[in-house]
């Protein structure tokens, strides 16, 4: 089966990679604009060079083509704790990330909000903090895992699903109890 | 079909309390982000509160921070927004949408809306 192509391809797919075909007239190739620039106007014959401008501030565009704006920056997310790692230019979107000892979590495929890492503390570290997932802790003895943090098993209801955590620990404070009373 | 519904929402007055509900079918409602959105009159939407599927991860909106609790019951494919202290700008459609999907066909996963009014 072929696949679908929307007309933007099947029209370049006519001319050499590195052209695209001339909007009015279907037997012209026009070379497409370099990554920085985008297209002011097509190229008037073969063999002759398209108008391309470069992207003004705040605009860019990451690849060659054959746009007629260039795609505004984006702007990282204060409100989701991003910070800019590095700032736009002409061939290069906005750059946004989290600070150190922090990681990403994705609300949807483009939004993510920024979360300290977690430090593991009553327990140790089993997998380290990376950008896009937090930190994996291990408790120790007497703590079970709750939104990725220790808590005593002191605060473990019945009806939780920390009771099987807790179990072997409340179990061997009845043994002690109960070797006690011999 | 991927469903919505959204209630609790009505009139109250400046300083009350309201509590917005979501039940959601037609989606496995445990693998998804969710949250609320609000339009307020003439104005754009606004995030209000976003959470993940097992509580962990949180978002609110600076200018709810500290008087709206966002939570989800995973057994009852609900999600609730408690909203305390309420004042008139709080007054707009409030939309619970799935989160995970903006992007895509998003308006595929919102619900109606339900409106809440503040004002004495």
């Known amino acids: 089966l072929v696949p679908h192509l929307g007309d933007r391809e099947k029209r370049d797919s006519v001319c050499p990679q590195g052209k695209y075909i001339h909007p009015q007239n279907n037997s012209i190739c026009c070379t497409k604009c370099h990554k920085g620039t985008y297209l002011y106007n097509d190229c008037p014959g073969p063999g002759q060079d398209t108008d391309c401008r470069e992207c003004e501030s705040g605009s860019f565009t990451a690849s060659e083509n054959h746009l007629r704006h260039c795609l505004s920056c984006s702007k990282c997310r204060k409100e989701m704790g991003q910070v800019e790692i590095s700032s736009c230019t002409v061939d290069r979107d906005t750059v946004c990330g989290c600070r150190k000892n922090q990681y990403r979590h994705y609300w949807s495929e483009n939004l993510f909000q920024c979360f300290n890492c977690s430090l593991c503390l009553n327990g140790t570290v089993h997998l380290s903090c990376q950008e896009k997932q937090n930190t994996v802790c291990t408790c120790h003895a007497g703590f079970f895992l709750r939104e990725n943090e220790c808590v005593s098993c002191s605060n473990c209801k019945k009806s939780l699903e920390c009771t099987k955590l807790c179990l072997p620990q409340i179990e061997n404070v009845k043994g002690t109890e109960d070797s006690g009373t011999t | 079909e991927v469903q919505l519904l959204e209630s609790g929402g009505g009139l109250v007055q400046p300083g009350g309390s309201l509590r917005l509900s979501c039940a959601a079918s037609?989606?496995?409602?445990?693998?998804?982000?969710m949250g609320w959105v609000r339009q307020a009159p003439g104005k754009g939407l606004e995030w209000v509160s976003f959470i993940d599927p097992p509580s962990v991860h949180t978002y609110y909106a600076d200018s709810v921070k500290g008087r709206f609790t966002i939570s989800r019951d995973n057994s009852k494919n609900t999600l609730y927004l408690q909203m305390n202290s309420l004042r008139a700008e709080d007054t707009a459609v409030y939309y619970c949408?799935?989160?995970?999907?903006?992007?895509?066909?998003?308006?595929?996963?919102w619900g109606q809306g339900t409106l809440v009014t503040v004002s004495s």
């Open positions: 037609g989606f496995t409602f445990t693998r998804y982000n």
């Open positions: 949408a799935n989160i995970s999907q903006f992007g895509s066909n998003a308006f595929d996963y």
